[in-house]
Amino acid sequence: EVEKTACPSGKKAREIDESLIFYKKWELEACVDAALLATQMDRVNAIPFTYEQLDVLKHKLDELYPQGYPESVIQHLGYLFLKMSPEDIRKWNVTSLETLKALLEVNKGHEMSPQVATLIDRFVKGRGQLDKDTLDTLTAFYPGYLCSLSPEELSSVPPSSIWAVRPQDLDTCDPRQLDVLYPKARLAFQNMNGSEYFVKIQSFLGGAPTEDLKALSQQNVSMDLATFMKLRTDAVLPLTVAEVQKLLGPHVEGLKAEERHRPVRDWILRQRQDDLDTLGLGLQG
């Protein structure tokens, strides 16, 4: 907390500029008008303030806006955003995607901080759902974002937003999350033709039920083993040898290398040896 002291003669700030970097903390407190700071926030980022000086500037804004900053200020916080606590951010009402992007840019290249997580949470709750543009933005900055959400949170994702999802965005999703996302993806891509549909739906198949896998096996999709290994065990077990062979196509040979791993191991144990022998892979049930 900086003590209240009068501003020395001639030091009253007329605008936010480079001369302020030579001000001591108490001088910034005394000589910079909070309202001026708020209207010229966009200039702060261009000035190499120390962390201590930024603390003073934040303190001034906190005094001016005890109920939370307006979006016009938030959008131009820049590196001052890194000084905010989750408690500060919970007071904000961020509705503009541009504001969100500007703040995410400040944290770019770093892990998602508690501040960023709070910001995103506030933004998404304010919008009511994870629309396509928001999802596009969030996954661009944080590819693992989608998989950080709970199944309950994912249920608010509209099918139209699924178009923004890239395969790498689902890399860390667990089966429970894919169970929620798969039906949305199926709905989103339903009007695509066979091969195009498979390319899009492939990343979501960890949530697919047996009947959908059976249907895919009739379409010459040539599923790769990496995708097959991520399928739900309970969805794979009822598939016949013929269905798995048609589902994997030329990749069926890969079953040999995975015969000791789930779901392949459990599936092999469910099959008749005569049926397994038709594959010519030496699989032992």
Partner: nanobody, 122 residues
Framework: EVQLVESGGGLVQPGGSLRLSCAAS?????MGWFRQAPGKGREGVAH????????VYADSVKGRFVLSRDNSKNTMYLQMNSLRAEDTAMYYC??????????????????WGQGTLVTVSS
Amino acid sequence: EVQLVESGGGLVQPGGSLRLSCAASEFTYSMGWFRQAPGKGREGVAHIYTRGGTTVYADSVKGRFVLSRDNSKNTMYLQMNSLRAEDTAMYYCAARTIFEGSWSSPSSFDFWGQGTLVTVSS
């Protein structure tokens, strides 16, 4: 359309060896050798998944025949050792692009060579 050309057949004495070759016009993931003796049906002899090289053999040739491939030449080879009179047949090379049915069933394969004759006789 995959073109398959076999070679290497001929006359050999019992206990002798032959090496059959099958050259494909393009890469295929799955290739096999079938044979058909006079008056009999076509039977699967051996099969290879060309990418990983996984092989399987009919019980009647296991331990005597060895299947290999050279992917740089899109060619499959069948080394036949300890040949017997009952190995006499027309040997066909086959390839498939659609994966249905057993490796030993001719109906599972969509491309075939013209065949090369192997005669085992003293």
